[in-house]
C-alpha cells in the first residue's frame, strides 16, 4: 500500500528547494525567498534561520539548506547548530558565572574555552616531571627516576610527551 501511495503521490517528485503546492494542484513550486527545503517531497518550506545581533552568518541560506551562524569574536559557539554564544577566556582561565577566573594551582587550560583540568600525575606512570606545569600548560613527563640514577645500564629515551589539553569539548 505504501509503495502504491507513493507512486500515486505527485509530491514525491518535488525535489529539494521546492514544495508541493496544494493551492496549485500539487505542482512543485520553488521555495519563497528566505525559506528552504532540504529534502524532496515536502509540502512546505522551512523559514531560514537569521543570524542576528552577535550571531554572524557563516553560510547564507539557500533554497536547499538553512543558514549557519557563528559568534562574533570574543565569544564562541555552543549547542547544536550554534544555538548559543559563550564567552571566550584567556588560556590559563576557565569560565564561571562570575566571569573568567584563573586556573587553580595544579590545573591548566590551554584553550580559550572549556574548564581547567588537573596536571598529569607523572608518578602514576612511573615517570618524573621533566617540565613543570603552568596555568596554561600541562606538565611534561620524563623518564622514570630509576632511569636517571647513576650507573643505570641503559637509559631509554623518554616516550614522546602526549599532546596536552585535547579533551573532548
Amino acid at each position: 500500500f505504501e509503495r502504491t501511495r507513493s507512486l500515486q503521490d505527485p509530491c514525491s517528485n518535488c525535489p529539494a528547494g521546492t514544495f508541493c503546492d496544494n493551492n496549485r494542484n500539487q505542482i512543485c513550486s520553488p521555495c519563497p525567498p528566505n525559506s528552504f527545503s532540504s529534502a524532496g517531497g515536502q509540502r512546505t518550506c522551512d523559514i531560514c534561520r537569521q543570524c542576528k545581533g552577535v550571531f554572524r552568518t557563516r553560510k547564507e541560506c539557500s533554497s536547499t539548506s538553512n543558514a549557519e551562524c557563528d559568534c562574533t569574536p570574543g565569544f564562541h559557539c555552543l549547542g547544536a547548530g550554534c544555538s548559543m554564544c559563550e564567552q571566550d577566556c584567556k588560556q590559563g582561565q576557565e569560565l564561571t558565572k562570575k566571569g573568567c577566573k584563573d586556573c587553580c594551582f595544579g590545573t591548566f587550560n590551554d584553550q580559550k574555552r572549556g574548564i581547567c583540568r588537573p596536571w598529569t600525575n607523572c608518578s602514576l606512570d612511573g615517570k618524573s616531571v621533566l617540565v613543570n606545569g603552568t596555568k596554561e600548560r600541562d606538565v611534561v613527563c620524563g623518564p622514570s627516576p630509576a632511569d636517571l640514577s647513576p650507573g643505570a645500564s641503559s637509559v631509554t629515551p623518554p616516550a614522546p610527551a602526549r599532546e596536552p589539553g585535547h579533551s573532548p569539548q
Epitope: V54, L78, G79, S83, M84, E86, Q87, T96, K97
Partner: nanobody, 123 residues
Framework: EVQLVESGGGLVQPGGSLRLSCAAS????????MSWVRQAPGRGLEWVAN????????YYVDSVKGRFTISRDNAKSSLYLQMNSLRAEDTAVYYC????????????????WGQGTTVTVSS
C-alpha cells in the same frame, strides 16, 4: 516570538550616567539568568554583568565594578543596567542576552540576544 529589545543608549559626557533597559517578551523571563554584553568599536564582545533569576546573585567584569549596577524587574520582564561614572572606554554597543537552559551549571552560553543600544561617552 522570543525577543529582547534594548533602549536607553545615547551620548553622555565622561563622568555622566545612563540607565539601559531591556524589555523581554515571548518567554518566562523569571526563569532565566540574564546578562549585559558590550562590543566596543573595532573590538570583540565583552561580557559586562549578569544576574540570576531572582536577582540575588550579580556579577561584574572588573572594569565596571563599583560603577555599573545590574538589576531586574520580573513583574515587568525587564532587565536594567545603571551606568555611573562613565568613561570613554565604556563607549560600545550594549546587548542584553538570555542565559541558556544550563547557565550556571556547566555552560554559560547565551541563546537569545537583543539588537543592541549604542552608548557613546565623549566630551
Amino acid at each position: 516570538e522570543v525577543q529582547l529589545v534594548e533602549s536607553g543608549g545615547g551620548l553622555v559626557q565622561p563622568g555622566g550616567s545612563l540607565r539601559l533597559s531591556c524589555a523581554a517578551s515571548g518567554f518566562t523571563f523569571s526563569n532565566y539568568w540574564m546578562s549585559w554584553v558590550r562590543q566596543a568599536p573595532g573590538r570583540g564582545l565583552e561580557w559586562v554583568a549578569n544576574i540570576n533569576q531572582d536577582g540575588s546573585e550579580k556579577y561584574y567584569v572588573d572594569s565596571v565594578k563599583g560603577r555599573f549596577t545590574i538589576s531586574r524587574d520580573n513583574a515587568k520582564s525587564s532587565l536594567y543596567l545603571q551606568m555611573n561614572s562613565l568613561r570613554a572606554e565604556d563607549t560600545a554597543v550594549y546587548y542584553c542576552a538570555r542565559g541558556g537552559e544550563e547557565y550556571s551549571s556547566s555552560h554559560y552560553g547565551m541563546d537569545v540576544w537583543g539588537q543592541g543600544t549604542t552608548v557613546t561617552v565623549s566630551s
